[in-house]
Interface confidence: low
């Protein structure tokens, strides 16, 4: 298959309400119809599926109804929001991106987004 | 087990429209894995890749014959057709229509599924 | 468009016979991007390997593809009576599809 680069954010810091999003920028070689984006953690060198969806040029990233994930595209831009984090799924969060037509296919694998979850402390209780 | 079949006249008078329905059995046409193409064949001669569509109706089409072919897809009915306008002689061939799978491990894509084909002959 | 080339146009062998097919392409396909597929007559084209080097399902092991960039074969090691039929190239590197002109083998 052919190279094809793609360019995510460093680092980003998920909310308090678990909820982190990032922006997956991909160099498409030539007019794409058909994309294929997945987001894959690795932890401690395990590599995992966090959430794919395929999507038609113009048309909205459908992930699986049980999907973490959500997301929008334009252009050669994907928008992408994983919900429901905790500080356990603290990790490298790495955006895979494959052009599925027209051919010939190209797949780029981004860097790597460090994403770093805080659990909430708990309220603490009130005496009224 | 897949099938397809192809049906539509197998006459058709010069400057007229061939139309061409491939009606899929035994799968979704809607399947996002896959795409569907016809293809074609002159008698005694090898084989032209007319064009492809996939189940939201994004359409691919060979230059040679782009400004005379348009494709569609009915995933309602689970079929898919084929128009090729302004016919000629030359257009005489065995139409073939066919699944088009695509082959994550490579990127390839290949036709897996034909249908068994039909003569349309372009005839006054 | 990418142009596939097909060589011998005919090839005449002997049942248990190895044949051997070849395919050129115009310009380079890579190593993946190249179909085989087996014609009977009377029939509609079969695919034997995709890939390059992949066989379909069902296909026997006799069949195997090889080659990258420019240059592919097909191989059948063993030949047997029903594999006397026409085959055809195809790239799916570059729209459009384009196939081979074929290579018919007969019995010799």
């Known amino acids: 298959c052919k190279a094809m680069h793609v360019a995510q954010p460093a680092v980003v810091l998920a909310s308090s309400r678990g909820i982190a999003s990032f922006v997956c920028e991909y160099a498409s070689p030539g007019k794409a119809t058909e994309v294929r984006v997945t987001v894959l953690r690795q932890a401690d060198s395990q590599v995992t599926e966090v959430c794919a969806a395929t999507y038609m040029m113009g048309n909205e990233l459908t992930f699986l109804d049980d999907s973490i994930c959500t997301g929008t595209s334009s252009g050669n831009q994907v928008n992408l929001t994983i919900q429901g984090l905790r500080a356990m799924d603290t990790g490298l969060y790495i955006c895979k991106v494959e052009l599925m037509y027209p051919p010939p296919y190209y797949l780029g694998i981004g860097n790597g987004t460090q994403i770093y979850v805080i659990d909430p402390e708990p309220c603490p209780d009130s005496d009224f | 087990q897949l099938q397809l079949q192809e049906s539509g006249p197998g006459l058709v008078k010069p400057s007229e429209t061939l139309s061409l329905t491939c009606t899929v059995s035994?799968?979704?046409?809607?399947?996002?894995?896959?795409?569907w193409g016809w293809i074609r064949q002159p008698p005694g001669k090898g084989l032209e890749w007319i064009g492809s569509i996939y189940y939201s109706g994004s359409t691919y089409y060979n230059p040679s014959l782009k400004s005379r072919v348009t494709i569609s897809v009915d995933t309602s009915k689970n079929q898919f057709s084929l128009e090729l306008s302004s016919v000629a002689a030359a257009d005489t061939a065995v139409y073939y229509c066919?699944?088009?799978?695509?082959?994550?491990?490579?990127?390839?894509?290949?036709?897996?599924?034909w249908g068994q084909g039909t003569l349309v002959t372009v005839s006054s | 468009e990418i142009v596939m080339t097909q060589s011998p146009a005919t090839l005449s062998l002997s049942p248990g016979e190895r044949a051997t097919l070849s395919c050129r392409a115009s310009q380079s396909v890579s190593s993946s991007y190249l179909s085989w597929y087996q014609q009977r007559p009377g029939q509609a084209p079969r695919l034997l390997i995709y890939?390059?080097?992949t066989r379909a399902t069902g296909i026997p092991a006799r069949f195997s593809g090889s080659g990258s960039g420019t240059d592919f074969t097909l191989t059948i090691s063993s030949l047997q009576p029903e594999d006397f039929a026409v085959y055809y190239c195809?790239?799916?590197?570059?729209?459009?599809?384009?196939f081979g002109q074929g290579t018919k083998l007969e019995i010799k």
């Open positions: 035994g799968g979704s046409i809607s399947s996002s894995s896959y795409y």
């Open positions: 195809q790239q799916d590197y570059n729209l459009p599809y384009t």
């Open positions: 890939g390059a080097s």
């Open positions: 066919a699944r088009v799978s695509y082959y994550y491990g490579s990127g390839s894509y290949y036709f897996d599924y």
